[in-house]
Interface confidence: low
Protein backbone atom coordinates (compact mmCIF):
# COMPACT_ATOMS: atom_id res chain seq x y z
CA UNK A 1 0.00 0.00 0.00
CA UNK A 2 1.15 3.53 -0.59
CA UNK A 3 0.86 6.24 2.02
CA UNK A 4 -0.33 9.72 1.10
CA UNK A 5 2.79 11.63 2.02
CA UNK A 6 1.64 14.81 0.31
CA UNK A 7 -1.40 15.20 2.55
CA UNK A 8 -1.21 18.51 4.37
CA UNK A 9 -2.17 18.10 8.01
CA UNK A 10 -3.65 20.95 10.00
CA UNK A 11 -3.05 20.88 13.75
CA UNK A 12 -0.63 18.73 15.72
CA UNK A 13 0.78 15.56 14.23
CA UNK A 14 2.29 13.18 16.74
CA UNK A 15 4.17 10.20 15.34
CA UNK A 16 4.45 7.54 17.98
CA UNK A 17 7.04 4.77 17.80
CA UNK A 18 5.61 1.30 18.30
CA UNK A 19 5.86 -0.39 21.67
CA UNK A 20 7.49 -3.74 22.16
CA UNK A 21 5.15 -6.60 21.17
CA UNK A 22 2.98 -7.48 24.13
CA UNK A 23 3.10 -3.96 25.55
CA UNK A 24 0.16 -1.65 25.08
CA UNK A 25 0.97 2.01 24.50
CA UNK A 26 -1.63 4.36 26.03
CA UNK A 27 -2.06 7.44 23.84
CA UNK A 28 -4.30 10.48 24.06
CA UNK A 29 -4.90 12.85 21.13
CA UNK A 30 -6.94 15.99 20.78
CA UNK A 31 -9.98 16.17 18.53
CA UNK A 32 -8.83 17.30 15.08
CA UNK A 33 -5.28 16.02 15.55
CA UNK A 34 -3.57 13.70 13.12
CA UNK A 35 -3.00 10.37 14.85
CA UNK A 36 0.17 8.73 13.57
CA UNK A 37 1.13 5.30 14.81
CA UNK A 38 4.46 3.80 13.84
CA UNK A 39 5.31 0.13 14.04
CA UNK A 40 8.89 -0.57 12.89
CA UNK A 41 9.86 -4.22 12.27
CA UNK A 42 11.08 -6.03 15.38
CA UNK A 43 14.86 -6.10 15.46
CA UNK A 44 14.98 -3.88 12.41
CA UNK A 45 14.59 -6.84 10.03
CA UNK A 46 12.08 -7.31 7.22
CA UNK A 47 8.49 -7.34 8.43
CA UNK A 48 6.52 -8.82 5.52
CA UNK A 49 2.93 -7.85 4.73
CA UNK A 50 1.06 -6.28 7.65
CA UNK A 51 -2.48 -5.29 8.48
CA UNK A 52 -3.70 -2.53 10.80
CA UNK A 53 -6.67 -3.46 12.97
CA UNK A 54 -8.93 -1.30 15.15
CA UNK A 55 -11.12 -2.96 17.78
CA UNK A 56 -10.73 -6.31 16.07
CA UNK A 57 -11.57 -5.30 12.52
CA UNK A 58 -9.26 -4.45 9.62
CA UNK A 59 -8.95 -0.74 8.86
CA UNK A 60 -10.15 0.32 5.43
CA UNK A 61 -7.98 3.03 3.81
CA UNK A 62 -9.86 6.20 2.92
CA UNK A 63 -9.18 9.86 2.34
CA UNK A 64 -8.85 10.19 6.13
CA UNK A 65 -7.28 6.85 7.06
CA UNK A 66 -3.92 6.33 5.39
CA UNK A 67 -2.50 2.85 5.81
CA UNK A 68 1.12 1.92 5.24
CA UNK A 69 3.07 -1.22 6.09
CA UNK A 70 4.78 0.35 9.12
CA UNK A 71 2.67 3.43 9.74
CA UNK A 72 -0.97 4.35 10.26
CA UNK A 73 -2.20 7.91 9.92
CA UNK A 74 -5.72 9.00 10.90
CA UNK A 75 -6.38 12.59 9.89
CA UNK A 76 -8.71 14.99 11.67
CA UNK A 77 -9.30 12.53 14.50
CA UNK A 78 -12.62 12.46 16.35
CA UNK A 79 -14.05 10.52 19.28
CA UNK A 80 -15.02 7.63 16.99
CA UNK A 81 -11.32 7.02 16.34
CA UNK A 82 -10.71 6.07 19.97
CA UNK A 83 -10.04 2.38 20.46
CA UNK A 84 -7.53 -0.44 20.46
CA UNK A 85 -5.22 -0.38 17.43
CA UNK A 86 -2.79 -3.11 16.50
CA UNK A 87 -0.40 -3.82 13.67
CA UNK A 88 -0.34 -7.52 12.78
CA UNK A 89 1.51 -9.76 10.39
CA UNK A 90 -0.97 -10.42 7.61
CA UNK A 91 -0.38 -14.17 7.30
CA UNK A 92 0.04 -15.19 10.95
CA UNK A 93 -2.05 -12.39 12.49
CA UNK A 94 0.71 -12.05 15.10
CA UNK A 95 0.43 -8.70 16.90
CA UNK A 96 3.58 -6.65 16.28
CA UNK A 97 2.46 -3.43 17.98
CA UNK A 98 -0.51 -2.53 20.14
CA UNK A 99 -1.86 0.93 20.99
CA UNK A 100 -4.74 2.18 23.08
CA UNK A 101 -5.87 5.46 21.53
CA UNK A 102 -8.22 7.98 23.09
CA UNK A 103 -9.31 11.12 21.25
CA UNK A 104 -10.65 13.82 23.50
CA UNK A 105 -11.16 17.58 23.79
CA UNK A 106 -10.28 17.45 27.49
CA UNK A 107 -9.81 14.69 30.09
CA UNK A 108 -13.22 13.05 30.35
CA UNK A 109 -14.95 9.71 30.70
CA UNK A 110 -14.83 7.65 27.54
CA UNK A 111 -18.59 7.82 27.17
CA UNK A 112 -18.84 11.59 27.08
CA UNK A 113 -19.66 13.32 23.84
CA UNK A 114 -18.56 16.62 22.55
CA UNK A 115 -21.60 18.84 22.39
CA UNK A 116 -20.83 20.17 18.94
CA UNK A 117 -23.97 18.78 17.40
CA UNK A 118 -26.35 20.29 19.93
CA UNK A 119 -29.12 22.40 18.45
CA UNK A 120 -28.01 25.96 18.03
CA UNK A 121 -29.81 29.20 17.36
CA UNK A 122 -29.48 29.57 13.62
CA UNK A 123 -31.06 32.97 13.49
CA UNK A 124 -33.87 31.62 11.33
CA UNK A 125 -37.30 32.66 12.61
CA UNK A 126 -39.07 29.47 11.58
CA UNK A 127 -38.06 26.54 9.47
CA UNK A 128 -38.31 22.87 8.66
CA UNK A 129 -35.61 20.53 9.96
CA UNK A 130 -32.33 20.20 8.07
CA UNK A 131 -29.12 18.24 8.53
CA UNK A 132 -26.35 20.27 10.13
CA UNK A 133 -23.52 17.80 9.47
CA UNK A 134 -24.47 15.86 6.32
CA UNK A 135 -20.82 14.95 5.74
CA UNK A 136 -21.00 12.87 8.92
CA UNK A 137 -23.92 10.88 7.52
CA UNK A 138 -22.21 9.57 4.38
CA UNK A 139 -21.60 6.08 5.70
CA UNK A 140 -24.98 4.42 5.18
CA UNK A 141 -23.76 0.83 5.59
CA UNK A 142 -21.97 -0.12 8.79
CA UNK A 143 -20.41 -3.55 9.22
CA UNK A 144 -18.95 -4.14 12.68
CA UNK A 145 -17.76 -7.17 14.61
CA UNK A 146 -20.02 -8.47 17.36
CA UNK A 147 -19.49 -6.94 20.83
CA UNK A 148 -18.60 -3.52 19.42
CA UNK A 149 -20.42 -0.31 20.25
CA UNK A 150 -22.38 1.29 17.41
CA UNK A 151 -23.50 4.90 17.23
CA UNK A 152 -25.80 6.34 14.58
CA UNK A 153 -25.97 10.13 14.36
CA UNK A 154 -28.40 12.46 12.63
CA UNK A 155 -27.29 15.96 13.69
CA UNK A 156 -30.05 18.37 12.72
CA UNK A 157 -31.55 21.77 13.44
CA UNK A 158 -34.70 23.73 12.77
CA UNK A 159 -36.98 26.24 14.39
CA UNK A 160 -38.69 25.20 16.53
CA UNK A 161 -36.03 22.70 17.56
CA UNK A 162 -37.11 19.39 15.99
CA UNK A 163 -37.66 16.14 17.85
CA UNK A 164 -35.83 12.93 16.91
CA UNK A 165 -37.15 9.39 17.03
CA UNK A 166 -35.75 6.08 15.80
CA UNK A 167 -37.16 3.17 13.83
CA UNK A 168 -35.72 -0.30 13.32
CA UNK A 169 -36.80 -1.94 10.07
CA UNK A 170 -39.57 0.64 9.78
CA UNK A 171 -41.01 0.14 13.28
CA UNK A 172 -40.65 2.19 16.45
CA UNK A 173 -37.43 1.27 18.25
CA UNK A 174 -37.18 1.40 22.02
CA UNK A 175 -34.66 0.24 24.61
CA UNK A 176 -36.69 -2.78 25.65
CA UNK A 177 -36.40 -4.12 22.10
CA UNK A 178 -32.84 -5.28 22.68
CA UNK A 179 -30.84 -6.93 25.46
CA UNK A 180 -28.55 -4.27 26.88
CA UNK A 181 -30.94 -1.53 25.87
CA UNK A 182 -30.08 1.58 23.91
CA UNK A 183 -28.90 5.08 24.69
CA UNK A 184 -30.77 7.92 23.07
CA UNK A 185 -28.81 11.13 23.23
CA UNK A 186 -31.18 13.78 21.97
CA UNK A 187 -28.62 16.52 22.54
CA UNK A 188 -26.23 14.72 20.20
CA UNK A 189 -28.96 13.44 17.87
CA UNK A 190 -27.61 9.94 18.34
CA UNK A 191 -28.57 6.35 19.02
CA UNK A 192 -25.98 4.20 20.80
CA UNK A 193 -26.05 0.41 21.07
CA UNK A 194 -23.36 -1.26 23.13
CA UNK A 195 -22.09 -4.79 22.63
CA UNK A 196 -23.99 -5.48 19.42
CA UNK A 197 -25.06 -9.01 18.50
CA UNK A 198 -26.25 -10.54 15.19
CA UNK A 199 -29.90 -9.88 16.10
CA UNK A 200 -29.12 -6.15 15.95
CA UNK A 201 -28.71 -6.38 12.18
CA UNK A 202 -31.19 -4.27 10.26
CA UNK A 203 -32.16 -0.85 8.97
CA UNK A 204 -32.14 2.01 11.49
CA UNK A 205 -33.95 5.20 10.57
CA UNK A 206 -33.81 8.51 12.38
CA UNK A 207 -36.91 10.68 11.95
CA UNK A 208 -36.39 14.37 12.69
CA UNK A 209 -39.49 16.55 12.66
CA UNK A 210 -41.10 19.76 13.73
CA UNK A 211 -44.38 21.38 12.74
CA UNK A 212 -42.84 22.60 9.47
CA UNK A 213 -41.62 19.29 8.16
CA UNK A 214 -39.88 15.98 8.60
CA UNK A 215 -36.59 14.50 7.36
CA UNK A 216 -35.22 11.01 7.76
CA UNK A 217 -32.08 9.01 7.18
CA UNK A 218 -31.67 5.22 7.11
CA UNK A 219 -28.53 3.35 8.11
CA UNK A 220 -27.96 -0.38 7.59
CA UNK A 221 -26.16 -2.30 10.32
CA UNK A 222 -24.46 -5.63 9.68
CA UNK A 223 -22.99 -7.43 12.67
CA UNK A 224 -20.11 -9.75 11.84
CA UNK A 225 -19.65 -12.92 13.83
CA UNK A 226 -16.55 -12.77 15.99
CA UNK A 227 -15.25 -16.18 15.00
CA UNK A 228 -13.04 -15.75 11.95
CA UNK A 229 -13.99 -17.77 8.90
CA UNK A 230 -12.68 -18.46 5.45
CA UNK A 231 -13.97 -16.02 2.83
CA UNK A 232 -17.59 -16.31 1.72
CA UNK A 233 -18.17 -15.82 -2.01
CA UNK A 234 -21.34 -14.91 -3.82
CA UNK A 235 -21.38 -15.03 -7.61
CA UNK A 236 -22.97 -12.08 -9.35
CA UNK A 237 -25.63 -13.14 -11.82
CA UNK A 238 -25.43 -14.46 -14.42
CA UNK A 239 -22.46 -16.62 -13.49
CA UNK A 240 -22.52 -18.30 -16.91
CA UNK A 241 -22.47 -16.02 -19.89
CA UNK A 242 -22.63 -16.26 -23.66
CA UNK A 243 -20.93 -13.43 -25.51
CA UNK A 244 -20.64 -12.29 -29.10
CA UNK A 245 -17.19 -12.10 -30.64
CA UNK A 246 -15.70 -8.66 -30.03
CA UNK A 247 -18.09 -7.71 -27.23
CA UNK A 248 -17.23 -6.92 -23.62
CA UNK A 249 -18.07 -9.13 -20.65
CA UNK A 250 -18.07 -8.56 -16.90
CA UNK A 251 -18.10 -11.18 -14.16
CA UNK A 252 -19.04 -10.09 -10.64
CA UNK A 253 -18.01 -11.79 -7.43
CA UNK A 254 -18.83 -10.63 -3.90
CA UNK A 255 -16.24 -11.49 -1.27
CA UNK A 256 -16.99 -11.36 2.45
CA UNK A 257 -14.08 -11.83 4.85
CA UNK A 258 -13.33 -10.29 8.23
CA UNK A 259 -9.67 -11.17 7.73
CA UNK A 260 -8.18 -9.33 4.76
CA UNK A 261 -8.38 -11.74 1.84
CA UNK A 262 -6.07 -12.21 -1.11
CA UNK A 263 -8.43 -12.07 -4.09
CA UNK A 264 -7.58 -13.52 -7.48
CA UNK A 265 -9.28 -13.89 -10.83
CA UNK A 266 -8.01 -17.01 -12.56
CA UNK A 267 -8.67 -18.75 -15.86
CA UNK A 268 -8.41 -22.46 -16.49
CA UNK A 269 -5.96 -23.15 -19.31
CA UNK A 270 -4.50 -26.11 -21.15
CA UNK A 271 -0.81 -26.95 -21.15
CA UNK A 272 0.32 -29.36 -23.86
CA UNK A 273 -3.29 -30.37 -24.39
CA UNK A 274 -3.86 -31.17 -20.72
CA UNK A 275 -6.09 -29.26 -18.29
CA UNK A 276 -4.44 -30.70 -15.18
CA UNK A 277 -0.88 -31.18 -14.01
CA UNK A 278 0.77 -34.49 -13.07
CA UNK A 279 -0.57 -34.16 -9.51
CA UNK A 280 -4.14 -33.58 -10.71
CA UNK A 281 -4.10 -29.86 -9.99
CA UNK A 282 -5.82 -27.81 -12.71
CA UNK A 283 -3.66 -25.46 -14.74
CA UNK A 284 -4.72 -21.85 -14.19
CA UNK A 285 -3.41 -18.46 -15.20
CA UNK A 286 -3.69 -15.44 -12.89
CA UNK A 287 -5.55 -12.53 -14.47
CA UNK A 288 -5.86 -10.23 -11.47
CA UNK A 289 -4.49 -10.46 -7.96
CA UNK A 290 -4.60 -8.12 -4.99
CA UNK A 291 -5.12 -7.90 -1.24
CA UNK A 292 -8.56 -6.54 -0.37
CA UNK A 293 -8.66 -4.06 2.46
CA UNK A 294 -12.38 -4.21 3.06
CA UNK A 295 -14.65 -6.63 4.89
CA UNK A 296 -16.91 -6.75 1.84
CA UNK A 297 -15.60 -6.43 -1.70
CA UNK A 298 -17.55 -6.43 -4.95
CA UNK A 299 -14.89 -7.53 -7.42
CA UNK A 300 -15.28 -7.50 -11.16
CA UNK A 301 -13.40 -9.09 -13.98
CA UNK A 302 -13.79 -7.16 -17.20
CA UNK A 303 -12.96 -8.85 -20.49
CA UNK A 304 -12.91 -6.43 -23.39
CA UNK A 305 -13.22 -7.32 -27.06
CA UNK A 306 -13.53 -11.06 -26.39
CA UNK A 307 -12.30 -13.68 -28.83
CA UNK A 308 -12.98 -17.43 -28.95
CA UNK A 309 -9.90 -18.14 -26.87
CA UNK A 310 -11.46 -16.13 -24.02
CA UNK A 311 -14.13 -18.82 -23.69
CA UNK A 312 -13.83 -21.26 -20.82
CA UNK A 313 -13.94 -21.44 -17.06
CA UNK A 314 -12.94 -18.52 -14.83
CA UNK A 315 -12.46 -18.58 -11.08
CA UNK A 316 -12.91 -15.96 -8.42
CA UNK A 317 -10.67 -17.12 -5.56
CA UNK A 318 -10.32 -15.55 -2.11
CA UNK A 319 -7.79 -16.71 0.46
CA UNK A 320 -7.31 -15.62 4.05
CA UNK A 321 -5.32 -17.13 6.90
CA UNK A 322 -8.19 -19.54 7.64
CA UNK A 323 -8.87 -20.97 4.22
CA UNK A 324 -9.76 -20.62 0.55
CA UNK A 325 -13.05 -20.10 -1.26
CA UNK A 326 -13.69 -20.26 -5.00
CA UNK A 327 -16.55 -19.55 -7.38
CA UNK A 328 -16.57 -20.72 -10.98
CA UNK A 329 -17.81 -18.69 -13.94
CA UNK A 330 -18.26 -19.91 -17.51
CA UNK A 331 -17.94 -17.91 -20.69
CA UNK A 332 -18.79 -19.17 -24.14
CA UNK A 333 -17.95 -16.97 -27.11
CA UNK A 334 -19.72 -17.32 -30.46
CA UNK A 335 -20.11 -15.54 -33.75
CA UNK A 336 -23.07 -13.14 -33.83
CA UNK A 337 -25.70 -15.57 -35.18
CA UNK A 338 -24.89 -18.50 -32.92
CA UNK A 339 -24.88 -16.27 -29.85
CA UNK A 340 -28.26 -14.71 -30.74
CA UNK A 341 -29.83 -18.15 -31.26
CA UNK A 342 -28.43 -19.40 -27.96
CA UNK A 343 -29.72 -16.36 -26.11
CA UNK A 344 -33.20 -16.87 -27.59
CA UNK A 345 -33.16 -20.53 -26.53
CA UNK A 346 -32.04 -19.59 -23.02
CA UNK A 347 -34.77 -16.98 -22.85
CA UNK A 348 -37.43 -19.50 -23.82
CA UNK A 349 -36.13 -22.14 -21.44
CA UNK A 350 -35.79 -19.74 -18.51
CA UNK A 351 -32.39 -18.55 -17.37
CA UNK A 352 -30.41 -20.93 -15.21
CA UNK A 353 -27.90 -19.33 -12.88
CA UNK A 354 -25.14 -20.88 -10.83
CA UNK A 355 -25.04 -19.68 -7.24
Amino acid sequence: ESLGTEQRVVGRAAEVPGPEPGQQEQLVFGSGDAVELSCPPPGGGPMGPTVWVKDGTGLVPSERVLVGPQRLQVLNASHEDSGAYSCRQRLTQRVLCHFSVRVTDAPSSGDDEDGEDEAEDTGVDTGAPYWTRPERMDKKLLAVPAANTVRFRCPAAGNPTPSISWLKNGREFRGEHRIGGIKLRHQQWSLVMESVVPSDRGNYTCVVENKFGSIRQTYTLDVLERSPHRPILQAGLPANQTAVLGSDVEFHCKVYSDAQPHIQWLKHVEVNGSKVGPDGTPYVTVLKSWISESVEADVRLRLANVSERDGGEYLCRATNFIGVAEKAFWLSVHGPRAAEEELVEADEAGSVYAG
Epitope: E1, S2, L3, G4, Q7, P61, E63, L66, G246, S247, D248, K288, S289, W290, I291, E293, A297, D298, V299, R300, R302, A304, N305
Partner: antibody, heavy 120, light 106 residues
Amino acid sequence: EIQLQQSGPELVKPGASVKVSCKASGYAFTSYNMYWVKQSHGKSLEWIGYIDPYNGGTRDNQKFKGKATLTVDKSSSTAYMHLNSLTSEDSAVYYCAREGGNYEAWFAYWGQGTLVTVSA
Amino acid sequence: QIVLTQSPALMSASPGEKVTMTCSASSSVSYMYWYQQKPRSSPKPWIYLTSNLASGVPARFSGSGSGTSYSLTISSMEAEDAATYYCQQWSSNPLTFGAGTKLELK
Protein backbone atom coordinates in the same frame (compact mmCIF):
# COMPACT_ATOMS: atom_id res chain seq x y z
CA GLU B 1 -6.79 11.87 0.71
CA ILE B 2 -6.48 10.18 -2.65
CA GLN B 3 -4.33 12.34 -4.93
CA LEU B 4 -2.88 12.08 -8.43
CA GLN B 5 -0.11 14.62 -8.89
CA GLN B 6 1.02 15.14 -12.48
CA SER B 7 4.25 16.63 -13.80
CA GLY B 8 4.40 20.20 -15.07
CA PRO B 9 3.77 21.66 -18.55
CA GLU B 10 6.04 20.68 -21.44
CA LEU B 11 7.03 22.66 -24.52
CA VAL B 12 8.63 20.36 -27.09
CA LYS B 13 9.67 20.49 -30.73
CA PRO B 14 8.02 18.42 -33.47
CA GLY B 15 9.53 14.95 -33.76
CA ALA B 16 10.68 14.94 -30.14
CA SER B 17 9.24 12.84 -27.33
CA VAL B 18 8.00 13.58 -23.83
CA LYS B 19 7.36 11.61 -20.64
CA VAL B 20 4.46 12.67 -18.40
CA SER B 21 4.35 11.39 -14.82
CA CYS B 22 1.49 10.83 -12.39
CA LYS B 23 2.33 10.22 -8.73
CA ALA B 24 -0.42 8.51 -6.75
CA SER B 25 -0.92 8.79 -2.99
CA GLY B 26 -3.50 7.91 -0.39
CA TYR B 27 -4.39 4.42 -1.64
CA ALA B 28 -2.92 1.03 -2.57
CA PHE B 29 -1.32 1.89 -5.92
CA THR B 30 -1.18 -1.65 -7.32
CA SER B 31 -4.88 -2.34 -6.63
CA TYR B 32 -6.32 -0.02 -9.27
CA ASN B 33 -5.80 0.49 -12.99
CA MET B 34 -4.43 3.87 -14.08
CA TYR B 35 -5.90 5.45 -17.18
CA TRP B 36 -4.69 8.21 -19.48
CA VAL B 37 -6.98 10.65 -21.25
CA LYS B 38 -6.25 13.32 -23.86
CA GLN B 39 -8.10 16.62 -24.18
CA SER B 40 -7.19 18.83 -27.12
CA HIS B 41 -7.83 22.56 -26.71
CA GLY B 42 -11.55 23.26 -26.60
CA LYS B 43 -12.30 19.67 -27.52
CA SER B 44 -13.71 16.57 -25.90
CA LEU B 45 -11.91 13.74 -24.10
CA GLU B 46 -10.18 10.75 -25.70
CA TRP B 47 -9.18 7.58 -23.92
CA ILE B 48 -5.56 6.65 -24.61
CA GLY B 49 -5.27 3.43 -22.61
CA TYR B 50 -4.69 2.03 -19.16
CA ILE B 51 -2.07 0.14 -17.21
CA ASP B 52 -2.55 -2.33 -14.37
CA PRO B 53 0.20 -1.34 -11.89
CA TYR B 54 0.09 -4.79 -10.31
CA ASN B 55 1.51 -6.59 -13.33
CA GLY B 56 2.31 -3.84 -15.84
CA GLY B 57 -0.35 -5.12 -18.24
CA THR B 58 -1.74 -2.50 -20.60
CA ARG B 59 -4.73 -2.04 -22.88
CA ASP B 60 -4.55 0.68 -25.51
CA ASN B 61 -6.96 2.52 -27.70
CA GLN B 62 -5.85 1.41 -31.21
CA LYS B 63 -5.78 5.07 -32.24
CA PHE B 64 -2.83 5.67 -29.91
CA LYS B 65 -0.91 2.45 -30.66
CA GLY B 66 2.70 3.40 -31.29
CA LYS B 67 2.13 6.92 -30.01
CA ALA B 68 1.78 6.33 -26.27
CA THR B 69 3.68 3.89 -24.06
CA LEU B 70 2.45 3.34 -20.51
CA THR B 71 4.69 2.23 -17.64
CA VAL B 72 4.69 2.30 -13.83
CA ASP B 73 7.24 2.47 -11.04
CA LYS B 74 5.66 0.60 -8.14
CA SER B 75 8.33 1.69 -5.66
CA SER B 76 7.35 5.34 -6.05
CA SER B 77 3.66 4.75 -6.85
CA THR B 78 4.11 6.62 -10.11
CA ALA B 79 2.59 6.00 -13.53
CA TYR B 80 4.21 7.31 -16.71
CA MET B 81 3.09 7.98 -20.25
CA HIS B 82 5.75 8.33 -22.95
CA LEU B 83 4.62 10.13 -26.12
CA ASN B 84 6.88 9.91 -29.16
CA SER B 85 7.24 11.46 -32.63
CA LEU B 86 5.25 14.47 -31.52
CA THR B 87 3.34 16.65 -33.96
CA SER B 88 1.05 19.64 -33.49
CA GLU B 89 -1.86 17.18 -33.31
CA ASP B 90 -0.43 15.94 -30.02
CA SER B 91 -0.68 19.35 -28.37
CA ALA B 92 -3.22 18.82 -25.60
CA VAL B 93 -3.82 18.46 -21.89
CA TYR B 94 -3.14 14.89 -20.78
CA TYR B 95 -4.82 13.52 -17.66
CA CYS B 96 -4.11 10.47 -15.60
CA ALA B 97 -7.19 9.05 -13.90
CA ARG B 98 -7.81 6.21 -11.49
CA GLU B 99 -10.66 3.79 -11.96
CA GLY B 100 -13.45 3.84 -9.42
CA GLY B 101 -12.63 0.68 -7.53
CA ASN B 102 -15.22 -1.90 -8.44
CA TYR B 103 -16.51 0.23 -11.28
CA GLU B 104 -13.61 -0.27 -13.65
CA ALA B 105 -15.38 1.43 -16.53
CA TRP B 106 -15.17 4.94 -15.15
CA PHE B 107 -12.74 7.42 -13.63
CA ALA B 108 -13.33 8.41 -10.03
CA TYR B 109 -10.11 10.36 -9.44
CA TRP B 110 -8.26 12.64 -11.85
CA GLY B 111 -4.87 14.31 -11.92
CA GLN B 112 -4.70 18.07 -12.48
CA GLY B 113 -3.59 17.56 -16.09
CA THR B 114 -0.32 18.18 -17.92
CA LEU B 115 -0.26 20.59 -20.85
CA VAL B 116 1.95 19.41 -23.70
CA THR B 117 2.62 22.00 -26.40
CA VAL B 118 4.33 20.93 -29.62
CA SER B 119 5.81 23.89 -31.43
CA ALA B 120 8.81 24.63 -33.56
CA GLN C 1 -16.41 2.12 -32.24
CA ILE C 2 -19.47 3.43 -30.42
CA VAL C 3 -20.07 7.11 -31.10
CA LEU C 4 -21.78 9.13 -28.37
CA THR C 5 -23.72 12.16 -29.60
CA GLN C 6 -24.59 14.75 -26.98
CA SER C 7 -27.34 17.26 -27.50
CA PRO C 8 -27.66 20.10 -27.37
CA ALA C 9 -24.03 21.11 -27.78
CA LEU C 10 -24.75 24.42 -26.04
CA MET C 11 -27.65 25.38 -23.81
CA SER C 12 -28.49 28.04 -21.27
CA ALA C 13 -30.85 27.94 -18.32
CA SER C 14 -32.13 30.34 -15.68
CA PRO C 15 -31.80 29.62 -11.97
CA GLY C 16 -34.58 27.29 -10.83
CA GLU C 17 -35.21 26.00 -14.35
CA LYS C 18 -35.31 22.25 -15.08
CA VAL C 19 -32.50 21.13 -17.42
CA THR C 20 -32.24 17.93 -19.46
CA MET C 21 -29.38 16.96 -21.75
CA THR C 22 -29.13 13.75 -23.73
CA CYS C 23 -26.48 11.33 -24.87
CA SER C 24 -27.29 9.05 -27.81
CA ALA C 25 -25.15 5.99 -28.54
CA SER C 26 -24.62 4.61 -32.04
CA SER C 27 -25.06 1.08 -30.60
CA SER C 28 -26.63 -0.20 -27.42
CA VAL C 29 -24.54 0.23 -24.26
CA SER C 30 -24.98 -1.29 -20.80
CA TYR C 31 -24.28 1.78 -18.71
CA MET C 32 -23.53 5.45 -19.14
CA TYR C 33 -21.16 7.57 -17.06
CA TRP C 34 -21.14 11.35 -16.78
CA TYR C 35 -18.48 13.91 -15.86
CA GLN C 36 -18.64 17.62 -15.12
CA GLN C 37 -15.83 19.92 -16.23
CA LYS C 38 -15.36 23.61 -15.56
CA PRO C 39 -12.82 25.85 -17.37
CA ARG C 40 -9.20 25.24 -16.38
CA SER C 41 -10.16 22.26 -14.19
CA SER C 42 -10.01 18.50 -14.47
CA PRO C 43 -13.22 16.60 -15.18
CA LYS C 44 -15.08 15.50 -12.05
CA PRO C 45 -16.92 12.18 -11.75
CA TRP C 46 -20.62 13.02 -11.70
CA ILE C 47 -22.85 10.02 -12.42
CA TYR C 48 -21.83 6.36 -12.65
CA LEU C 49 -23.67 3.25 -13.79
CA THR C 50 -26.32 5.42 -15.50
CA SER C 51 -28.10 6.72 -12.39
CA ASN C 52 -25.78 6.73 -9.35
CA LEU C 53 -24.54 10.11 -8.15
CA ALA C 54 -20.84 10.37 -7.36
CA SER C 55 -19.84 11.52 -3.88
CA GLY C 56 -20.64 15.18 -3.28
CA VAL C 57 -22.96 15.59 -6.27
CA PRO C 58 -26.13 17.52 -5.31
CA ALA C 59 -29.38 15.55 -5.25
CA ARG C 60 -30.92 17.86 -7.85
CA PHE C 61 -28.94 15.88 -10.45
CA SER C 62 -30.23 12.59 -11.80
CA GLY C 63 -29.33 10.21 -14.60
CA SER C 64 -31.45 7.76 -16.52
CA GLY C 65 -31.70 5.80 -19.74
CA SER C 66 -30.99 2.46 -21.37
CA GLY C 67 -29.94 0.98 -24.68
CA THR C 68 -28.93 3.85 -26.95
CA SER C 69 -30.62 6.75 -25.16
CA TYR C 70 -29.42 8.31 -21.91
CA SER C 71 -29.98 11.61 -20.17
CA LEU C 72 -28.76 13.82 -17.35
CA THR C 73 -31.33 16.04 -15.62
CA ILE C 74 -31.02 18.95 -13.20
CA SER C 75 -34.32 19.47 -11.39
CA SER C 76 -33.59 23.10 -10.54
CA MET C 77 -30.68 24.92 -12.17
CA GLU C 78 -28.21 26.69 -9.90
CA ALA C 79 -25.35 29.01 -10.85
CA GLU C 80 -22.70 26.47 -9.82
CA ASP C 81 -24.11 23.94 -12.32
CA ALA C 82 -22.81 25.97 -15.27
CA ALA C 83 -20.17 23.69 -16.83
CA THR C 84 -19.56 21.23 -19.64
CA TYR C 85 -20.94 17.73 -19.14
CA TYR C 86 -19.48 14.69 -20.91
CA CYS C 87 -21.01 11.25 -21.21
CA GLN C 88 -18.82 8.12 -21.50
CA GLN C 89 -19.29 4.42 -22.25
CA TRP C 90 -17.18 1.31 -22.09
CA SER C 91 -19.61 -1.39 -23.13
CA SER C 92 -17.54 -1.80 -26.26
CA ASN C 93 -13.93 -1.10 -27.13
CA PRO C 94 -12.62 1.52 -27.30
CA LEU C 95 -13.91 3.51 -24.36
CA THR C 96 -15.45 6.69 -25.81
CA PHE C 97 -16.70 10.07 -24.62
CA GLY C 98 -19.36 12.33 -26.06
CA ALA C 99 -18.38 15.75 -27.41
CA GLY C 100 -19.96 17.43 -24.40
CA THR C 101 -22.91 19.69 -23.60
CA LYS C 102 -21.95 23.18 -22.45
CA LEU C 103 -24.49 24.49 -19.94
CA GLU C 104 -24.50 28.23 -19.35
CA LEU C 105 -26.36 30.35 -16.83
CA LYS C 106 -28.95 32.62 -18.43
